[in-house]
């Protein structure tokens, strides 16, 4: 089948990194600079993505694969293939239309991206709060109150928040 297909379509012999050049009698020509073809049998090469402005190059374009971008420090990727860069906030904050805002009481954000989330409700699981939550940290749940020995205090003050905390991914 492969042999039959290649007799019918000479372009199927062109490997990744080349294109089937109609202007040159369907000869396999290398992709021009700043373009690539990631599969064989292509009739054109795709233009390489350029990482400009707030984007920076994570992986250079090659003749067989597109460039990959990530974001400059202070920003993080959003969307498939890092299609957008969004501003980082500090731990204990979330990004709103008006910029970075502190988490409201009862919520936290332990990352430089994302939203403030409610502290975990330990009682959902029949547990008690072992370590109190802060703007930067969720509570830590502990054993159920019944599991604690008499006279034992269940709640520990929160651990001091420290940078860098949860790094942006």
């Amino acid at each position: 089948f492969e042999r039959t297909r290649s007799l019918q379509d000479p372009c199927s012999n062109c490997p990744a990194g080349t294109f089937c050049d109609n202007n040159r009698n369907q000869i396999c020509s290398p992709c021009p600079p700043n373009s690539f073809s990631s599969a064989g049998g292509q009739r054109t090469c795709d233009i390489c993505r350029q990482c400009k402005g707030v984007f920076r190059t994570r992986k250079e374009c090659s003749s067989t694969s597109n460039a990959e971008c990530d974001c400059t420090p202070g920003f993080h990727c959003l969307g498939a293939g890092c299609s957008m860069c969004e501003q980082d906030c500090k731990q204990g904050q979330e990004l709103t239309k008006k910029g970075c805002k502190d988490c409201c009481f009862g919520t936290f954000n332990d990352q430089k991206r994302g939203i403030c989330r409610p502290w975990t409700n330990c009682s959902l699981d029949g547990k008690s709060v072992l370590v109190n939550g802060t703007k930067e940290r969720d509570v830590v749940c502990g054993p159920s109150p019944a599991d604690l020995s008499p006279g034992a205090s269940s709640v520990t003050p929160p651990a001091p928040a420290r940078e860098p905390g949860h790094s942006p991914q």
Epitope: I115, T120, D125, V140, A159, G165, S167
Partner: antibody, heavy 119, light 107 residues
Framework: QVQLVQSGAEVKKPGASVKVSCKAS????????INWVRQAPGQGLEWAGN????????NYNQKFKDKATITADKSTSTAYMELSSLRSEDTAVYYC????????????WGQGTTVTVSS | DIQMTQSPSSLSASVGDRVTITCRPS??????LNWYQQKPDKTVKLLIY???RLRSGVPSRFSGSGSGTDFTFTISSLQPEDIATYFC?????????FGQGTKLEIK
């Protein structure tokens, strides 16, 4: 009781993809993080990423960013990790885990799914 | 990423012995340190969370201590059923990272 039941072993060819499932029961699925952890043969444990099923917010280990896609289906209380462009180095046992109440520890582990990549 | 240096990588001890494993993160992780047990059948179980808190149902011979960059896991009196590999894990900073494991064998 809290349980995570994973899909069965898979054998795949290099370049293929595989989707491992993790069905949760015995608790409110949307209220706890689900993590995915990899263990290559004879090696230690490696955190791949996690998902908060309530809003499908995900975190990834940079090492797995181009390899894994983590999703969750609230209607069936099932989390998934899809691995793409498989290579022999992806041969491993993949575990799903649930947090203990806050994301900082993993209290319940699935039985593990063995993924073998071989030509 | 935070590197977790766990030692020893393996150890052999007798029933009734006191066994100690250490875990040293490459940076301060406060008390966000957990210990897991992986049995030979590959099942994994959380034993200790937040440095020293014993998971409900886990025998009291298991304990943990430490803070910051120096942590210890102890089995006060080794039992035959404790044959397993033990891992530490930091939950302070993404990506979460594990120690390389300590394989425990009975003499």
């Amino acid at each position: 009781q809290v349980q995570l039941v994973q899909s069965g072993a898979e054998v795949k060819k290099p370049g293929a993809s595989v989707k491992v499932s993790c069905k949760a029961s015995g608790y409110t699925f949307t209220s706890y993080w689900i993590n995915w952890v990899r263990q290559a043969p004879g090696q230690g444990l490696e955190w791949a990423g996690n998902i908060y099923p309530s809003d499908s917010y995900t975190n990834y280990n940079q090492k797995f960013k181009d390899k894994a896609t983590i999703t969750a289906d609230k209607s069936t209380s099932t989390a998934y990790m899809e691995l793409s462009s498989l290579r022999s180095e992806d041969t491993a046992v993949y575990y799903c885990t649930r947090d203990y109440g806050s994301a900082y520890s993993m209290s319940t582990w699935g039985q593990g799914t063995t993924v073998t990549v071989s030509s | 990423d935070i590197q977790m240096t766990q030692s020893p990588s393996s150890l052999s001890a007798s029933v009734g012995d006191r066994v100690t494993i250490t875990c040293r993160p490459s940076q301060d992780i406060s008390n966000y340190l957990n210990w897991y047990q992986q049995k030979p059948d590959k099942t994994v179980k959380l034993l200790i969370y937040y440095t020293s808190r014993l998971r409900s149902g886990v025998p009291s011979r298991f304990s943990g201590s430490g803070s910051g960059t120096d942590f210890t896991f102890t089995i006060s009196s080794l039992q035959p059923e404790d044959i397993a590999t033990y891992f530490c894990q930091q939950g302070d900073t993404l990506p979460y990272t594990f120690g390389q494991g300590t394989k425990l064998e009975i003499k």
